[in-house]
């Protein structure tokens, strides 16, 4: 029976060009974490393997750093990152957990009234 | 001025499926997302989710998700959310609404249109 | 997904009153930065239901200023300083801080 339960960063806002850190957190279980996934609808992003470590996509490389911890931090960010994203644990003997996210981001003059959030 | 123009009430039969549609004007379309609600009995609201017009991303309620297709056109800056396989418990009121930039609220909603499921 | 409970169910008021309404969650409503996604609703009888308040406490444009909203992590009140008879309807709460986003059960504010 799978108790777990995933807690996540929560909706977040975004000023463009910005970044922010996407994480999650498994609790109320005792199975082993083997890996955790992060996607954004249908594209792997990274993954987080627990022996063989990251693997970020090519694609991202240049934008997505591992971490802090499981999460993931998101760089340089563009309009076009506006969306859903998944993390997925893979665990024993529970199986599969899925947190989600969304991340909107915004023009900067938008932002300045909006709820906006940059990492320095 | 922003509106948001839905189409008419849709009567059909179990087991059928539809699309509605929902015309804005007066904002840059893609600028901003569209959510979709639905009202049962007068009552409940419901988020069947969203969808992002600049990329055609999607964001759905589970309850929600192989029952509800959300679609956009950019050229007609018309937002469309197609049902199938429909049942008397699809039978309601379904809103679209324009996304508050920034704070995950809804600030302009469509007219509403009702859906009567019934053989 | 998060649960989001709103008392009363039914607010019988005299024009003139001043009200509140309660939006408990389930779980926090606050972000990793700090951001609280909730925003209220009132639903006329023949139209759409149409924004009051947003970020917790952030009037929509031409909403009048009898209307307040405030609270914090998962207990939230709009306030309706004086009530006039334009102000009756359904009353809705929306969380936007997780997915997927869920109203209230709705508050019914009628006349006594």
């Known amino acids: 029976m799978m108790t777990g339960t995933i807690e996540t960063t929560g909706n977040i806002s975004a000023e463009k060009g910005g970044s922010i850190i996407l994480q999650c957190h498994l609790s109320s279980t005792t199975a082993q974490v083997t890996q955790v996934n992060w996607e954004q609808q249908d594209q792997l992003l990274a993954i987080c393997n627990a022996d063989l470590g990251w693997h970020i996509s090519p694609s991202f490389k240049d934008r997505v750093a591992p971490g802090p911890g499981l999460g993931l931090t998101l760089q340089s960010l563009t309009v076009n990152d506006t969306g859903e994203y998944f993390c997925i644990y893979h665990t024993y003997p529970d199986g599969t957990y899925t947190g989600r996210i969304f991340l909107e981001v915004l023009e900067s003059s938008v932002a300045e009234h909006g709820a906006r959030f940059q990492i320095p | 001025e922003v509106h948001l123009q839905q189409s008419g009430p849709e009567l059909v039969k179990p087991g059928a499926s539809m699309k509605i549609s929902c015309k804005a004007s007066g904002y840059s379309f893609t600028d901003y997302i569209m959510n979709w609600v639905k009202q049962s009995h007068g009552k409940n609201l419901e988020w069947i989710g969203l969808i992002i017009p600049y990329n055609g991303g999607t964001s759905y309620n589970q309850k929600f998700k192989g029952k509800a297709t959300l679609t956009v056109d950019k050229s007609s800056s018309t937002a469309y959310m197609e049902f199938l396989s429909l049942t008397s418990e699809d039978s309601a009121v379904y809103y679209c609404?324009?996304?508050?930039?920034?704070?995950?609220?809804?600030?302009?909603w469509g007219q509403g249109t009702s859906v009567t499921v019934s053989s | 997904d998060v649960v989001v409970t709103q008392t009363p169910l039914s607010l019988p008021v005299s024009f003139g009153d001043q009200v509140s309404i309660s939006c408990r969650s389930s779980q926090s409503l606050a972000n990793s930065y700090g951001s609280t996604f909730l925003s209220w609703y009132l639903h006329k009888p023949g139209q759409s239901p149409q924004l009051l308040i947003y970020g917790i406490s952030n009037r929509f444009s031409g909403v009048p200023d009898r209307f307040s909203g405030s609270g914090s992590g998962t207990d939230f009140t709009l306030k309706i300083s004086t009530v006039k008879p334009e102000d009756l309807g359904m009353y809705y709460c929306l969380q936007g801080t997780h997915q997927p986003w869920t109203f209230g059960g709705g508050t019914k504010l009628e006349i006594k």
């Open positions: 609404a324009r996304g508050l930039r920034g704070y995950y609220a809804m600030d302009y």
